[in-house]
Structure formats: structure tokens, C-alpha cells
Amino acid sequence: MMTGTIETTGNISAEKGGSIILQCHLSSTTAQVTQVNWEQQDQLLAICNADLGWHISPSFKDRVAPGPGLGLTLQSLTVNDTGEYFCIYHTYPDGTYTGRIFLEVLESSVAEHGARFQIP
């Protein structure tokens, strides 16, 4: 029985050239998180494995930093970074939970950042 829910930063915007923190938080379950995958559309950005720690995909190594917590920091943003991002929580015994974040990267300097929070 999957009782958990994923809270995300939702729809967020950021300035071109800047950075943004993508955060998801799994709540309302005692399930053990075995791994969190971060994906952009169908591209794997990073993995945080409970045993092995972080792995950043080679093609994103220069612009993606692990954390804070199970979140992901995107740096040197470009307009091409606009799109959907997914946090995929593999848990035991519940199974797989998926959260969605939409990021819009703006040319303007008046980009408003969405709410952010850190995993305790």
C-alpha cells in the first residue's frame, strides 16, 4: 500500500545564467528510500543511491551539483533548460513515487523564484 506523497517546488522560474535548486520531499510514509533519480524529460541527470551516494550523468557534470539533501542544483542555466524535471523515489516496501517540477528559464532579470525548501 503506497501511502506516501511527494511534495515538490512545483512550477518555478529562474534567470538565464543563474542557478536553481530542485527539491522534492517524500512524506506520509515510513518507507525506506533506496534511491532517488533526477530526470529532465527522458534524460537522466543524477542518481542518489542510499548505499553508493551521488552519481551525476557525465553530460551534466559541469552544470549539475548534488544536494542540498536529496535535491539537485542546476547551474549556468540556459533557456534550453526550460521544461519538466522529475524526481523518482525508489522506496521499500512502497515502491516508486514520482514528483514533477516545471522550470522556466527567463532571459529577463525579473524572474521570480518559486518556493524552496530543504529536506530535513
Epitope: 503506497m2 525506506q32 533506496t34 534511491q35 533519480n37 537522466l44 542518481i47 543511491n49 542510499a50 548505499d51 553508493l52 552519481h55 525508489h90 521499500y92 516496501p93 512502497d94 515502491g95 516508486t96 514520482t98
Partner: antibody
Framework: EVMLVESGGGLVKPGGSLKLSCAAS????????MSWVRQTPEKRLEWAAT????????YYPDSVKGRFTISRDNAKNTLYLQMSSLRSEDTALYYC????????????WGQGTSVTVSS | DIQMNQSPSSLSASLGDTITITCHAS??????LNWYQQKPGNTPKLLIY???KLHTGVPSRFSGSGSGTGFTLTISSLQPEDIATYSC?????????FGGGTKLEIN
């Protein structure tokens, strides 16, 4: 080349024990989650146990919980399945399998070792 | 447990045909559905993961689709080497469960 070679299967009486081994080569064994999956005489596949790369976390279906223990020796590149209190319904071909790093699916399987539980 | 119902259980087709195998989950599994091929006397081989993603080295005549509870595996331009049993597996929740398999034969 990724290779997974199982051994240790055989004929055992109900209530008996058996320990299966899976020798891995061709990849960094400690970086991969591994599983045992069995195939019944009716050819249906059943997940039997999973262990994380470092060996710190193990997962089982209710049907084998408390009777089967999955473990690994990363220094020897070997995966194990200790089976006890065996039942006739445990009769199957047992495969060891490697999970994709994304943890979405099992990408390599061994050839399997046969376990028959019968009096 | 999530039940995976696969159909048909067996299928006979001719070389060059396009065939479709379906897998139905007893509850929503999003896109967490994998397809495996097992040739006679051989070990299972991953074909498709995450419902539609072709595993490395798998010919493009294989394709997968679906989400939620309904999924299909399609093999176009059937080849002799496609003779095998095909099984689906859900990765949405523990215990991971498999379909009963579809045995594909060539006419």
C-alpha cells in the same frame, strides 16, 4: 563482457536448506543492486530477493521472508542466496540478475541453477 | 500485490508480420513496466524498460507503449530469431511481479 554464473542448486527435502552462489565478472560488482529471480516449473517468473550495492539493504517478498537470506561478498564479486525451511513451491530455476543503475529493470541475467524440493 | 495479466498466452505468426502482446496491471503502475525476452533454453533478456525505452542493442522493430494499467509490446517485421517467450514485469511497487508470459511461434 558481463557474466553471471550461478551454482549450488540441487535436490533437497522439504524443510531442508541450500545455499546458491552467483559469480559476477565484467563489471564493477559493488556498484550494482542485484536480485534473485526464480522461474517456476510452469515457466512463470517470480522475484525472490534483492540486495543493494553495498549490501546494507535487503528486500524480500512475503513468500520467502524469514526463510531466504540474500547476501554478497563484494571482495569476491559473489552474490548468495541462503534458503532454509524449503517448501515444494520453492522448486524453480533460480537466476541472479543485475539491476540497471537507474533501478528501473534487470539488464543482465545468469543462466540459472535448478532447485528441486521433494521428498 | 499487483497482478500482471498478459495476453495472449501463446501466439503464432508469419515472418514479416507485426504482432502485439498486451499486459494489464491490476492497478496503476504509471510507466514502470519492463518487457523481457526469453529464447528457448536461454536466460531472460531485457528488451524494454519504463514502458517504452528500448534497451541497448535491442533492434528497433521492438517497441513498447502504454501507461497506467494498459501496456503493449509490438514486434514489427517478425524475424526467425524472435521465437521466444515474452514477459512483462511491473516495477511500481513491491513485490515486483511478472506476467504469465506469451509464447511466440512462427507459422
Amino acid at each position: 563482457e558481463v557474466m553471471l554464473v550461478e551454482s549450488g542448486g540441487g535436490l533437497v527435502k522439504p524443510g531442508g536448506s541450500l545455499k546458491l552462489s552467483c559469480a559476477a565478472s565484467g563489471f564493477t560488482f559493488s556498484s550494482y543492486t542485484m536480485s534473485w529471480v526464480r522461474q517456476t516449473p510452469e515457466k512463470r517468473l517470480e522475484w525472490a530477493a534483492t540486495i543493494s550495492g553495498g549490501g546494507g539493504n535487503t528486500y524480500y517478498p512475503d513468500s520467502v521472508k524469514g526463510r531466504f537470506t540474500i547476501s554478497r561478498d563484494n571482495a569476491k564479486n559473489t552474490l548468495y542466496l541462503q534458503m532454509s525451511s524449503l517448501r515444494s513451491e520453492d522448486t524453480a530455476l533460480y537466476y541472479c540478475a543485475r539491476w540497471l543503475p537507474t533501478y528501473y529493470a534487470m539488464d543482465y541475467w545468469g543462466q540459472g541453477t535448478s532447485v528441486t524440493v521433494s521428498s | 500485490d499487483i497482478q500482471m495479466n498478459q495476453s495472449p498466452s501463446s501466439l503464432s505468426a508469419s515472418l514479416g508480420d507485426t504482432i502485439t502482446i498486451t499486459c494489464h496491471a491490476s492497478q496503476n503502475i504509471n510507466v514502470w513496466l519492463n518487457w523481457y525476452q526469453q529464447k528457448p533454453g536461454n536466460t531472460p533478456k531485457l528488451l524494454i524498460y519504463k514502458a517504452s525505452k528500448l534497451h541497448t542493442g535491442v533492434p528497433s522493430r521492438f517497441s513498447g507503449s502504454g501507461s497506467g494499467t494498459g501496456f503493449t509490446l509490438t514486434i514489427s517485421s517478425l524475424q526467425p530469431e524472435d521465437i521466444a517467450t515474452y514477459s512483462c514485469q511491473q516495477g511500481q511497487s513491491y513485490p515486483y511481479t511478472f506476467g504469465g508470459g506469451t509464447k511466440l511461434e512462427i507459422n
